[in-house]
């Protein structure tokens, strides 16, 4: 049994880091493998992650972490029974993938304005709370070419757009994702999408 693709990990910079790797053949990850991880720090204890299958030869493990900060560095040991298959390290702050925003809502009751709001996925005491920026994707269910991205570079988790910038009388969907420049993160996953019917009064023409 050998590791074909070494584990690569990303952290949500809050409580979970996800590591993925591939073995050289079909593997029952949860019964055959264990990923041990330990913070390089005074008094830290070793923890064991039981991986799940991710395709025939792929494995994924969700590492639980408390109080993630930039100084943290973890040692990783991948074991198959008594055999050490791979040894490495992981610094969560250097591989951050933020959590996806939630609770995306479209408010259509403001005259001729669409207000989209969502929730910041981090608590106020997490460093990323005040450092997320967002991308909002809006698309038409009827017209695949009617697809747009709005970059939200301010901190407030909301976006206002004129209803008239979208076509009237058809349904639209929206979703939002986040990233943080300070840690050069990857984009988060998209939030679940939300749907609304866009209707507004055309301005009266003389």
């Amino acid at each position: 049994m050998k590791v074909l693709q070494e584990p690569t990990c990303v952290s949500d910079y809050m409580s979970i880091s996800t590591c993925e790797w591939k073995m050289n053949g079909p593997t029952n990850c949860s019964t055959e493998l264990r990923l041990l991880y330990q913070l390089v720090f005074l008094l830290s204890e070793a923890h064991t992650c039981i991986p799940e299958n991710n395709g025939g030869a792929g494995c994924v493990c969700h590492l639980l972490m408390d109080d993630v900060v930039s100084a943290d560095n973890y040692t990783l040991d991948l074991w198959a029974g008594q055999q050490l298959l791979w040894k490495g390290s992981f610094k969560p702050s250097e591989h951050v993938k933020p959590r996806a925003p939630g609770n995306l809502t479209v408010h259509t009751n403001v005259s001729d304005t669409l207000l989209l709001t969502w929730s910041n996925p981090y608590p106020p005491d997490n460093y990323l709370y005040n450092h997320l920026t967002y991308a909002v994707n809006i698309w038409s269910e009827n017209d695949p070419a009617d697809f747009r991205i709005y970059n939200v570079t301010y901190l407030e988790p909301s976006l206002r757009i004129a209803a008239s910038t979208l076509k009237s009388g058809i349904s639209y969907r929206a979703r939002v994702r986040a990233w943080a420049q300070c840690y050069n993160t990857t984009w988060s996953e998209w939030s679940p999408s939300t749907k609304w019917h866009n209707s507004y009064r055309e301005p009266f023409e003389q």
Partner: antibody, heavy 116, light 111 residues
């Protein structure tokens, strides 16, 4: 919000022991390390040791090895610091502080006076 | 005796900028992260800066931190009378054993 409430001031004689408590609230007690530091009158801060409330393991500054004991009670979210064989130079304000690589939150401090 | 050296005192007028230095070595500041603490008279220390340059929520952006090599600097702009306090740097010694270190402390006087 996070609160670290320490026990009240103590006056001790040389050779005696003192036990200072620090009750934590407002966060997951076992998810954060707790440090102890002290500050003699008019002096700077001095680190004494650290306890992991999850398992109770400890590490002490070399200067205090053999004289200090840190414990915790997870049922009351309280950590304790006991210093024995007190001498006059142990007169100081003793602080508990939550954190790992740095100290996020501090207790208000407990003044321990050692005097004959 | 701390191995992190700070100036004993600094002073400046309200509205001015002041910097406080913290000098260490390769086994501490040079190989670790720096934090800064403010201790107002008669109170417990309070975290001002961590991770060399990050501010906890609630700390105004008048306070900033930086690190270069084996030394670190705390800068305070737009000085206010309420900033008069003792300031301590902190880091970790990584050799021979891991222990936290505090600087010698600097008394800031707002003239």
């Amino acid at each position: 919000q996070v609160q670290l409430v320490q026990s009240g001031a103590e006056v001790k004689k040389p050779g005696a022991s003192v036990k200072v408590s620090c009750k934590a609230s407002g966060y997951a007690f076992t998810s954060y390390y707790m440090h102890w530091a002290r500050q003699a009158p008019g002096q700077g801060l001095e680190w004494m040791g650290i306890i992991n409330p999850s398992g109770g393991s400890t590490s002490y500054a070399q200067k205090f090895q053999g004289r200090v004991t840190m414990t915790r009670d997870t049922s009351t979210s309280t950590v304790y610091m006991e210093l024995s064989s007190l001498r006059s130079e142990d007169t100081a304000v003793y602080y508990c502080a939550r954190g790992k690589w740095w100290f996020y939150d501090w207790g208000k401090g407990t003044l321990v006076t050692v005097s004959s | 005796q701390s191995v992190l050296t700070q100036p004993p005192s600094v002073s400046a007028a309200p509205g001015q900028k002041v910097t406080i230095s913290c000098s260490g070595g390769s086994s501490n500041i040079g190989n670790s992260y720096v934090s800064w603490y403010q201790q107002l008279p008669g109170t417990a220390p309070k975290l001002l800066i961590y991770d060399n340059n990050k501010r906890p929520s609630g700390i105004p952006d008048r306070f900033s931190g930086s690190k270069s090599g084996t030394s670190a600097t705390l800068a305070i702009t737009g000085l206010q009378t309420g900033d008069e306090a003792d300031y301590y740097c902190g880091t970790w010694d990584t050799s021979p054993s891991m222990i936290p270190l505090f600087g010698t402390g600097t008394k800031l006087t707002v003239l």
